[in-house]
Structures are given as C-alpha cells and as structure tokens.
C-alpha cells in the first residue's frame, strides 16, 4: 500500500522537516528557517511559535517540532500548550477577580496556584485533630481518643478534602 501511495503521490515521500515543493516539481525541500513540519508528506511548513512577552522559550523550534513556551517567573501556564500565563499567588492564597486573596478561615492552599480548599474534617473519619490547619496547610488527623491506649501511636495522613470549591469572598 505504501508503495502504491508513493507512486500516486510523490509528496508522501517527503519526511518530517521538509515540505513538498510544488514550485520545484514536487521535490522535497527543507523547511525554511523559523518553520517546521512534524509529519511527512506536508505541502507546507508551519510557522514556529514565538515565545515573547510574558512567555519564555522552554524548547527551541526545530525543523520537525514547534517551539514550546512556559511563563516568566511569577506566572504559570494555563491552557493547552501553555496558551496563557496566569499570575502566581503565595501559598495560603487564591486568585480571585481582584487578585490574590488570603484563604478564608477553615480553608488552605499549599500551592502557588489553584483555589483554597476546606480543611479535612477529622471527625468524619472518627479521628481527632493532631495538628491544627493553617492557610497554607491542611490539618493533620490523629488517632481517635479511644485509640490512645498505651502503645498505640499511629498518625494517619489527612484524607483529601471532600468538597473542593471556592472559599467565600
């Protein structure tokens, strides 16, 4: 099938990094500077993405693959292929329409992005609070009071927050 196809379409022989040049009797020509073709048999090369402004180059464009961008410090990528850069907040904050705001009491965020999530409710698992939560850290649940018999000293990591959602502003 491949042989048949190449007999029918000479362009199918052009590998990635080249294009099938109609102006030169369908000869495979290398992609011009600042362009690429990631698959064979292409009739044009695509223009390389330029990482400008708040974007910085994570991977240079080559003849066979597009450039990849990430964000300048203080920002993080959003969207497919880092199509946008979103402002970082500090741990203990979340990004609102009016900028970074501290997590409300009873919620935390241990990252520079994302939303504040409710502290784990230890009592739902029959446990007690071993370490109090903060804006930046979830509570640490310990054994239930009934488990505190001599020799019992297991500390359970916190269960994931049940209802992640925006804290009220």
């Amino acid at each position: 099938f491949e042989r048949t196809r190449s007999l029918q379409d000479p362009c199918s022989n052009c590998p990635a990094g080249t294009f099938c040049d109609n102006n030169r009797n369908q000869i495979c020509s290398p992609c011009p500077p600042n362009s690429f073709s990631s698959a064979g048999g292409q009739r044009t090369c695509d223009i390389c993405r330029q990482c400008k402004g708040v974007f910085r180059t994570r991977k240079e464009c080559s003849s066979t693959s597009n450039a990849e961008c990430d964000c300048t410090p203080g920002f993080h990528c959003l969207g497919a292929g880092c199509s946008m850069c979103e402002q970082d907040c500090k741990q203990g904050q979340e990004l609102t329409k009016k900028g970074c705001k501290d997590c409300c009491f009873g919620t935390f965020n241990d990252q520079k992005r994302g939303i504040c999530r409710p502290w784990t409710n230890c009592s739902l698992d029959g446990k007690s609070v071993l370490v109090n939560g903060t804006k930046e850290r979830d509570v640490v649940c310990g054994p239930s009071p009934a488990d505190l018999s001599p020799g019992a000293s297991s500390v359970t990591p916190p269960a994931p927050a049940r209802e992640p959602g925006h804290s009220p502003q």
């Epitope: 330029q50 400008k52 402004g53 708040v54 974007f55 946008m84 850069c85 979103e86 402002q87 900028g99």
Partner: nanobody, 121 residues
Framework: QVQLVESGGGLVQAGGALRLSCAAS????????IGWFRQAPGKEREGVLC????????IYADSVKGRFTISRDNAKNTVYLQMNSLKPEDTAVYYC??????????????WGQGTQVTVSS
C-alpha cells in the same frame, strides 16, 4: 495600527524618582488592564505592577511595594508608573502591556517597545 509607547525613562541617582508613561494608540484603554514588566540585563522579564480597567492594582514584585504606584488617565489613553526611592536594582528596560485582565496574559496581548531606566549609585 495598535501601539503602546512607553516614555519617561532615563538616568537617575539612587533615591530619585521617575514617572513612566504608557500611551495607547489605535485602541482605547478603557476596557483593558495595563501591566508594567521589566527586564534587567542578563535576567528574566518580571512583572512589576498592573492596573485593571476598574482601577484595581495588582503588585507582582514585592520589592516595589511602597515605592512604585500605578495610575490611569482614560481621557488621555495613558497609564503612568510613578517610581520613587529608586534603587540600582531597579535598573532595567520597562515595558507596558495590555492584557484583558491583570491575572492572565496571552500571546495576543499588545506590548510596547520598552523604555530604559538606569539608577546609578
């Protein structure tokens, strides 16, 4: 043709002040945020301040708190960056940019060409 043009840069002694302007032409700033970024020689570009279309201010760089302020004059289609108590580490090319909102930037945003600020000790 859409353009952002920065002006007001120059050479100033440490402790001095400068006011940078970012003038927009080809579009109105009324519905756009305006951010200021800077890039020092050999360093990565960093956010400084941003003002939203409603006048809310976002400070990206903690190092400018209490020294830099941002304001807008929609009638003049211009945003100002007032820089007081300048330090040698504020030396950089300063750029203005027009995102839709201060928290999020895309490759469609308009950027100015930049204005050089040099603070000597």
């Amino acid at each position: 043709q859409v353009q952002l043009v920065e002006s007001g840069g120059g050479l100033v002694q440490a402790g001095g002040a400068l006011r940078l302007s970012c003038a927009a032409s080809g579009f109105t700033l009324d519905y756009s945020a305006i951010g200021w970024f800077r890039q020092a020689p050999g360093k990565e570009r960093e956010g400084v301040l941003c003002i939203s279309s409603s006048g809310d201010v976002t400070i990206y760089a903690d190092s400018v708190k209490g020294r830099f302020t941002i304001s807008r004059d929609n009638a003049k289609n211009t945003v100002y960056l007032q820089m007081n108590s300048l330090k040698p580490e504020d030396t950089a090319v300063y750029y203005c940019v027009a995102p839709r909102i201060c928290s999020t930037y895309s490759s469609d945003d308009y950027w100015g060409q930049g204005t050089q600020v040099t603070v000597s000790s």
